[in-house]
Interface confidence: low
């Protein structure tokens, strides 16, 4: 349904401050290191030019694509050459080149100081003096730092914080109330931004099919009661917004999700029989509530899957009219009869079928060769229980610092050469599933981590694609999407890396480690794990646990002594000089 | 998994002397951070005195300094606590504790270490009994 003007009709559909907000959102996400005022103000002219397309479609410049009306707003910023360098370049460049151009600078680490917390009472101040700015203010801030953040979710955690805000604001015990919000806001968004850069990825490095087939698991898991060509609408329509997202599309996509909701509402019937509670919430708590959705129940009596893909006679036959529709109907009956699996290992069954139906149908006699297809299936399902099962155990055992500590070590010890706070956060993150995944019975461990670890894993590859260092990286990122994490568990010591210099200044430190909180003192503590595995790649645990024993207790004794600077310097030269004794440097 | 046996206790009068030792088996001793703690009748376990791997960080509850003395032999897998100069209220069960440093007992930061290691010893023994009668 083609439109006069494209500007008009979104900002009609999604009403003044949706509209503002994720024009907000998107130039943020484009010029990740430009002002907040300077946004405000791009948006205000953006939206000042669209009331007057609302009032007349015919208006000069309404008729312009939306890509062409924001491409032209962001060219007009002054300072684009010596803020972003080769980025200007794309100014040059003709719609659509012009767009794909901008969303190959979009910085996935940008070098933005870290979001430092106020007192509650200044941020109760701010937020009462100009609510309208302050919840700008977040959307702005966590657009830019979280370029692929999906932008009608972001709207969603906009509203809580505003709720956060006005419910603690006018509490007895103001930070009691917020900071335990702001937390879990936090946690929830870093998980978020991450969930959708893994879309973002599947759809740009490896192409809609990709994104297609994991929808299809992970929708056929959550609505097992939906019918095959059902669950192809809802994947269609969600390929669409996701694609629009992740294209920089912001409005569009915004506007299709809010009708998927709708649709899916409409049509819970002969979806699942738990949206329900989601499907009476307002517009951006019921998308997000249908995103979050738990599984329905299976139908019963499920026949077996072998008599139409394995026993029948007509399956080379029906693979030949229609391979993807047939390999879909494969992974939607495989993937409804199995919500204990990970999205990822029913997508490697399905690629294991194609395989053998691509050899086998060419083959003299087709039913013969693939006669045991499911068998070639049991050490693929195997392979990520018994992983899962023992990394649970060593879990259990360690806890989840510890935890952390030993990825940490295997991690570097695969892959030295990815930068120190890259290894850090990614072997963090990695060990978190151990608290995220291990407690669920062993029904819901496996969806739990393997599908959490691709996530993990997909930030390792995309920060790594920044700047590559390392081949084996780029092998496991590329190769395979739903292997990436078979690929990772399977490298081995890196054995040609050359040990880096033992450089001192990298274990010298001062009065201010004495301030951090828990979790920043970790990070200092596995920061210098990861360097001294990158000094002495072949030390034994023993050693490492030493050498960091010494380090933590020298740094304990420092920020307790009067003089801790003094402390950190003469002691610290001590501590240097035994770990290299220690260590055999 | 590590084993610990603590030894030396009994009882002694106000001003006495006992050395308490601790012998750890099933693991790599000398890679492990060792710590004193005790726990009077009704009260919590708390820290007395810790010492790193390698004997170069020690740490005291303020109530035993210049009385108590921790050190540590790696090639007999023990600790020691020499108590001299006892106190009725240090009368009770002590514990030796050990902490798996690639976990990092001693935390970094502001706070003292006994609260960190405490919580983070990973092996504990049965205990051994001391009492000060005045």
């Known amino acids: 349904d083609a439109h006069k003007s494209e500007v008009a009709h979104r900002f009609k559909d999604l009403g003044e401050e949706n509209f503002k907000a994720l024009v907000l959102i998107a130039f943020a996400q484009y010029l990740q290191q430009c002002p907040f005022e300077d946004h405000v103000k791009l948006v205000n002219e953006v939206t000042e030019f669209a009331k007057t397309c609302v009032a007349d479609e015919s208006a000069e410049n309404c008729d312009k694509s939306l890509h062409t009306l924001f491409g032209d707003k962001l060219c007009t910023v002054a300072t684009l050459r010596e803020t972003y360098g080769e980025m200007a370049d794309c100014c040059a460049k003709q719609e659509p080149e012009r767009n794909e151009c901008f969303l190959q600078h979009k910085d996935d680490n940008p070098n933005l100081p870290r979001l430092v917390r106020p007192e509650v009472d200044v941020m109760c101040t701010a937020f009462h003096d100009n609510e309208e700015t302050f919840l700008k203010k977040y959307l702005y801030e966590i657009a830019r730092r979280h370029p692929y953040f999906y932008a009608p979710e972001l709207l969603f955690f906009a509203k809580r914080y505003k709720a956060a805000f006005t419910e603690c604001c006018q509490a007895a015990d103001k930070a009691a109330c917020l900071l335990p919000k702001l937390d879990e806001l936090r946690d929830e968004g870093k998980a978020s931004s991450a969930k959708q850069r893994l879309k973002c990825a599947s759809l740009q490095k490896f192409g809609e099919r990709a994104f297609k087939a994991w929808a299809v698991a992970r929708l056929s898991q959550r609505f097992p009661k939906a019918e095959f060509a059902e669950v192809s609408k809802l994947v269609t329509d969600l390929t669409k917004v996701h694609t629009e997202c992740c294209h920089g599309d912001l409005l569009e996509c915004a506007d299709d999700r809010a009708d998927l909701a709708k649709y899916i509402c409409e049509n819970q019937d002969s979806i699942s029989s738990k949206l329900k509670e989601c499907c009476e919430k307002p517009l951006l708590e019921k998308s997000h509530c249908i995103a979050e959705v738990e599984n329905d129940e299976m139908p019963a009596d499920l026949p077996s899957l072998a008599a139409d893909f394995v026993e029948s006679k007509d399956v080379c036959k029906n693979y030949a009219e229609a391979k993807d529709v047939f390999l879909g109907m494969f992974l939607y009956e495989y993937a409804r009869r199995h919500p204990d699996y990970s999205v990822v290992l029913l997508l490697r069954l399905a690629k294991t079928y194609e395989t053998t139906l691509e050899k086998c149908c060419a083959a003299a006699d087709p039913h013969e060769c693939y006669a045991k297809v499911f068998d070639e299936f049991k050490p693929l399902v195997e392979e990520p229980q018994n992983l899962i099962k023992q990394n649970c155990e060593l879990f259990e055992q360690l806890g989840e610092y510890k935890f952390q500590n030993a990825l940490l070590v295997r991690y570097t010890k695969k892959v030295p050469q990815v930068s120190t706070p890259t290894l850090v956060e990614v072997s963090r993150n990695l060990g978190k599933v151990g608290s995220k995944c291990c407690k669920h019975p062993e029904a819901k461990r496996m969806p739990c981590a393997e599908d959490y670890l691709s996530v993990v894993l997909n930030q390792l590859c995309v920060l790594h694609e920044k700047t590559p260092v390392s081949d084996r990286v780029t092998k496991c990122c590329t190769e395979s999407l739903v292997n990436r994490r078979p690929c990772f568990s399977a490298l081995e010591v890196d054995e040609t890396y050359v040990p880096k210099e033992f450089n001192a200044e990298t274990f010298t430190f001062h009065a201010d480690i004495c301030t951090l909180s828990e979790k920043e003192r970790q990070i200092k503590k596995q920061t210098a794990l990861v360097e001294l595995v990158k000094h002495k790649p072949k030390a034994t645990k023993e050693q490492l646990k030493a050498v960091m024993d010494d380090f933590a207790a020298f740094v304990e004794k420092c920020c307790k002594a009067d003089d801790k600077e003094t402390c950190f310097a003469e002691e610290g030269k001590k501590l240097v000089a035994a770990s290299q004794a220690a260590l055999g440097l | 998994d590590v084993q610990l046996v603590e030894s030396g206790g009994g009882s002694v009068q106000a001003g006495g002397s006992l050395r308490l030792s601790c012998a750890a088996s099933?693991?790599?001793?000398?890679?492990?951070?060792m710590g004193w703690y005790r726990q009077a009748p009704g009260k919590e376990r708390e820290f007395v005195s810790g010492?790193?791997?390698?004997?170069?960080?020690?740490d005291y509850v303020d109530s035993v300094k210049g009385r108590f003395t921790i050190s540590r032999d790696n090639a007999k897998n023990t600790v020691y606590l020499q108590m001299n100069s006892l106190k009725p209220e240090d009368t009770a069960v002590y514990y030796c504790?050990?902490?798996?440093?690639?976990?990092?007992?001693?935390?970094?930061?502001?706070?003292?270490?006994?609260?960190?290691?405490?919580?983070?010893?990973?092996?504990w023994g049965q205990g051994t009994q001391v009492t000060v009668s005045s």
């Open positions: 504790g050990a902490a798996d440093p690639m976990g990092l007992g001693y935390g970094l930061g502001p706070r003292p270490v006994d609260r960190l290691l405490s919580a983070e010893c990973d092996y």
């Open positions: 099933g693991g790599t001793f000398s890679s492990y951070a």
């Open positions: 010492i790193s791997w390698s004997g170069s960080s020690i």
